[in-house]
């Protein structure tokens, strides 16, 4: 058993049929010694008396808010949560496996630049009685500070018969050094509590591996005289690290119709302009990627050919 | 060329070669991003390799003030990785695929380090750690880790030279 926060405790249980469970001793936070009784949740049934209460925690029915009273007055509370371990593996019932970029990916994180700011998100089908708390650091043995905000519900979508809820959190490394080569990864830890179930999820990454620039901005077209060709120009996204002579991007320019199966023109360039062939009913799209490190491409920025 | 005395390197040549290094480092191990090597006890390996750190002057302001600190750090790293790529880790079993770009990568690391430090000038170089894994599978894992960390190192070096070529070239 360990303390998650004040008056909230997590009991770690091996979860299998007829498991013996864990013996837990609760102590009432009071100077009083006599006339103390214990109850669980809303029940008025007295579970025991005395300054301490010893219980055998085996299942969710044994978890909940234990309260010690004296003469009708509440003295203190202890909330017990369960963390299940099945076949040596901690349960992951609360969050959905996003399966990208690999199986057992519960947390996904992205950064728009090298400033040390990043966003992580996760998915669940649970809509109520759900709380998250996020901590982060650079490195684990001698951790350096990363400050995370509160996790918020950022999207809801319908997937078949189920509703899916996306939560996200923004974090900022306290002393970021955008130009340095990272040697210690960022660690992100998410505590998830659903009703009386506790689970924790972790992710470890370098900012360079989660970079995904915003799409290029201000796409403009200039038809070339006596030619089918069009000069397309664009600018670096505002959110990208500066100076651009140091933090350079490379670009992919593509002309394609509405369907992915249609023919296309495609060219790669380090410049912020390119010459392509425009077709009626097609769009010109441009996306960006770090020039020197193969992290994710941005989403496409598009303008119609016409 | 960058010499200990403090003259300027051939920024444009260094830029071209460092960008080539980036391409080669990724073609040597393109799927590196899909392999979570941190789970495999990274500490003993990649903590020994030289990293370009915050105080090394490789940021745009540091380069403007005095690029020599940064260039010396890059040079140390290039020599270090050049030695690693020529070591038993890469030459031993399992043999590299014949079409592996590691050979080109090795030669290009040497080429860039020579651009930075011509014959007859000496910057102190970092001691290469004795990483001699006994098992072929350990060697394979070590290669992946070294290439992954090399990708990060050459990316910073390429940014330095690109910025230098754009803003510091005479």
């Amino acid at each position: 058993i360990w303390e998650l926060k004040k008056d909230v405790y997590v009991v770690e249980l091996d979860w299998y049929p007829d498991a013996p469970g864990e013996m837990v001793v609760l102590t009432c936070d009071t100077p009083e010694e006599d006339g103390i009784t214990w109850t669980l949740d809303q029940s008025s049934e007295v579970l025991g008396s005395g300054k301490t209460l010893t219980i055998q925690v085996k299942e969710f029915g044994d978890a909940g808010q234990y309260t010690c009273h004296k003469g009708g007055e509440v003295l203190s509370h202890s909330l017990l949560l369960l963390h299940k371990k099945e076949d040596g593996i901690w349960s992951t019932d609360i969050l959905k496996d996003q399966k990208e970029p690999k199986n057992k990916t519960f947390l996904r994180c992205e950064a728009k630049n090298y400033s040390g700011r990043f966003t992580c998100w996760w998915l669940t089908t649970i809509s109520t009685d759900l709380t998250f708390s996020v901590k982060s650091s650079r490195g684990s043995s001698d951790p350096q500070g990363v400050t995370c905000g509160a996790a918020t519900l950022s999207a809801e979508r319908v997937r078949g018969d189920n509703k899916e809820y996306e939560y996200s959190v923004e974090c900022q490394e306290d002393s970021a050094c955008p130009a340095a080569e990272e040697s210690l990864p960022i660690e992100v830890m998410v505590d998830a509590v659903h009703k009386l179930k506790y689970e924790n999820y972790t992710s470890s990454f370098f900012i360079r591996d989660i970079i995904k620039p915003d799409p290029p901005k201000n796409l403009q077209l200039k038809p070339l005289k006596n030619s089918r060709q069009v000069e397309v120009s664009w600018e670096y996204p505002d959110t990208w690290s500066t100076p651009h002579s140091y933090f350079s991007l490379t670009f992919c320019v593509q002309v394609q119709g509405k369907s992915k199966r249609e023919k296309k023109d495609r060219v790669f360039t380090d410049k912020t302009s390119a010459t392509v062939i425009c077709r009626k009913n097609a769009s010109i799209s441009v996306r960006a990627q770090d020039r020197y490190y193969s992290s994710s491409w941005s989403e496409w920025a598009s303008v119609p050919c016409s | 060329r960058a010499v200990p005395g403090g003259s300027s390197p051939a920024w444009t040549q260094c830029q071209q070669l460092s960008q080539k290094l980036c391409t080669l480092a990724w073609s040597a191990h393109p799927l590196v991003g899909h392999m979570d090597l941190r789970e495999e006890g990274d500490e003993e390996t990649t903590n020994d390799v030289p990293h370009i750190q915050c105080g090394d002057g490789c940021d745009p302001q540091g380069l403007r003030d005095n690029s020599q600190f940064c260039l010396q750090r890059i040079h140390q790293g290039l020599i270090f990785y050049e030695k690693l790529l020529g070591s038993d880790i890469f030459t031993g079993e399992p043999s590299l695929l014949p079409d592996s770009p590691v050979g080109q990568l090795h030669a290009s690391l040497l080429g860039l380090s020579q651009l930075l430090q011509p014959e007859g000038h000496h910057w102190e170089t970092q001691q290469i750690p004795s990483l001699s894994p006994s098992q072929p599978w350990q060697r394979l894992l070590l290669r992946f880790k070294i290439l992954r960390s090399l990708q990060a190192f050459v990316a910073v070096a390429a940014r330095v030279f690109a910025h230098g070529a754009a803003t510091l070239s005479p």
Partner: antibody
Framework: QVQLVQSGAEVEKPGASVKVSCKAS????????LHWVRQAPGQGLEWMGW????????EYAPKFQGGVTMTTDTSTSTAYMELRSLRSDDTAVYYC???????????WGQGTMVTVSS | EIVMTQSPATLSVSPGERATLSCRAS??????LHWYQQKPGQAPRLLIY???QSISGIPARFSGSGSGTEFTLTISSLQSEDFAVYYC?????????FGGGTKVEIK
């Protein structure tokens, strides 16, 4: 599968014109760009231009501008390349090729030998 | 127009050996570079597109690398059917241009 079959060899006199055909099969004709590339005997490859069968748009290499016309007939899935004012150095194998991507050449025809000789 | 230069013009290699072919562009072309193989009396065949992307059906012994102005085609272990002429082609800008070719012959 995608296939391009070209017309047979031609022998022409200097100053004449030649029209080479290229019949496509195995795909929707308007879904691919069509290019023409030539190769003089013992020499390298030379790009001549492309046509979009969907709308008849063309782009020719500057060297061939004014001397070449590329057309298509969507009813027969056939592309044509006409080269005018032939000279002896136009002697070459002419290839048509098709691709969904505009700038490189995936599927090639077998080639048509055009000999220009007086 | 962009001029593509291939070297060497002829490469003599023994079967089973590795062959490294070079292609240089007269200006930076990013990764807009493609490789073709041509055997006598046949049309060229696409091997690699956008500098390093492999084509399904092409043996894994063919690999490409490079960006900017310098590119390499590597054939890891030459088979008898690999003796041919190899061309690079840039697609950075029109007109599309080819290198002069490298003939890989049996040593």
């Amino acid at each position: 599968q995608v296939q391009l079959v070209q017309s047979g060899a031609e022998v022409e006199k200097p100053g004449a014109s030649v029209k080479v055909s290229c019949k496509a099969s195995g795909y929707t004709f308007t879904d691919y760009y069509l290019h023409w590339v030539r190769q003089a005997p013992g020499q390298g490859l030379e790009w001549m231009g492309w046509i979009d069968p969907e709308n008849g748009d063309t782009e020719y290499a500057p060297k061939f501008q004014g001397g070449v016309t590329m057309t298509t007939d969507t009813s027969t899935s056939t592309a044509y390349m006409e080269l005018r004012s032939l000279r002896s150095d136009d002697t070459a194998v002419y290839y048509c090729n098709a691709n969904k991507e505009l700038r490189y050449f995936d599927v090639w025809g077998q080639g048509t030998m055009v000999t220009v000789s007086s | 127009e962009i001029v593509m230069t291939q070297s060497p013009a002829t490469l003599s290699v023994s079967p089973g050996e590795r062959a490294t072919l070079s292609c240089r562009a007269s200006q930076s072309i990013s990764i807009n570079l493609h490789w073709y193989q041509q055997k006598p009396g046949q049309a060229p065949r696409l091997l690699i597109y956008f500098a390093s992307q492999s084509i399904s059906g092409i043996p894994a012994r063919f690999s490409g690398s490079g960006s900017g102005t310098e590119f390499t085609l590597t054939i890891s272990s030459l088979q008898s059917e690999d003796f041919a002429v190899y061309y690079c082609q840039q697609s950075n800008s029109f007109p599309l241009t080819f290198g002069g070719g490298t003939k890989v012959e049996i040593k």
